[in-house]
């Protein structure tokens, strides 16, 4: 297939406080080999939300089984959303490297806005 693209189909998602937010991301190709990570924000100050390779992210679950052969779906669900979670989330593909993986391509981002919890 052609060179990998990172697809985030939704420019924005709105979720009520206390609910879960699904952030969708998929790849158009299995190549190059390497993990994906989710970040909030861009640039040097971005916050790591999920790392496919390692780490403990108790509020984050993957929508698909990432270990499944030929999986292209790297969507995540973040539970118990609060106003502090608002921001733009980027799904980023890394190319496997030595000693460190190298950022390969980022999705366009999905802006998460948080509505007040219905009374």
């Amino acid at each position: 297939e052609d060179e990998l693209q990172v697809i985030q189909p939704e420019k924005s998602v709105s979720v009520a406080a206390g609910e879960s937010a699904t952030l969708r991301c998929a790849m158009t190709s299995l190549i190059p080999v390497g993990p994906i990570m989710w970040f909030r924000g861009a640039g040097a100050g971005r916050e790591l939300i999920y790392n496919q390779k390692e780490g403990h992210f108790p509020r984050v679950t993957t929508v698909s089984e990432l270990t499944k052969r030929n999986n292209l779906d790297f969507s995540i669900s973040i539970s118990n959303i609060t106003p502090a979670d608002a921001g733009t989330y980027y799904c980023v593909k890394f190319r496997k490297g030595s000693p460190d993986d190298v950022e390969f391509k980022s999705g366009a981002g999905t802006e998460l806005s948080v509505r007040a919890k219905p009374s």
Epitope: E1, D2, Q5, I7, P9, T22, R24, A26, M27, T28, V63, S64, E65, L72, D73, S75
Partner: antibody
Amino acid sequence: QVQLVESGGGVVQPGRSLRLSCAASGFTFSAYGMNWVRQAPGKGLEWVSAISASGRSTFYADSVKGRFTISRDNSKNTLYLQMNSLRAEDTAVYYCAKDFTEVVGWLGMDVWGQGTTVTVSS
Amino acid sequence: EIVMTQSPGTLSLSPGERATLSCRASQSVSSSYLAWYQQKPGQAPRLLIYGASSRATGIPDRFSGSGSGTDFTLTISRLEPEDFAVYYCQLLGSSPRTFGGGTKVEIK
């Protein structure tokens, strides 16, 4: 606007062949996977075949594997379905449909043509 | 091959009522690959819900999707006259991209 227009349907005898076409406009055809879905008279939807954006990967339902061939010409913005060894049970309205995103077979099919009717009868 | 089973086959309701349509997979599937379509007589299907729970562009918020694993639901909170149609779920992703048999929502 985004549009898919199927053509090539008709009445054909069992064992014969037919080629359906689907002309796409209003979107970057070469960026999206495409599908054929059929619907027999009074019945539900049946997915038939799909093809990746570049055309290098193809997928088929078991019921048509070995008889039908999906292809595309990105320079002409056209999707094809070559149907050989046709059977009475292939009688249906055939729709072409565009994948919702650039990822093949992810999330759904968001644009559909109005369909072309294929009748297989002696 | 995963089989998608929709129930009920027919739902007879009045405008203003709530419709709950079920789609069950024969084995667990990712919600990213579950879509719902609406089809009216003589028309092509229309994508309503993708990823089990996200409304497609232009779909009114009375339509909602939910579920995970093997059990998925399409809910129409208050039926409008134009909602009487046949609804199909579809499993995407792997091949074949199976449709359920459909649920017809008819006027009571």
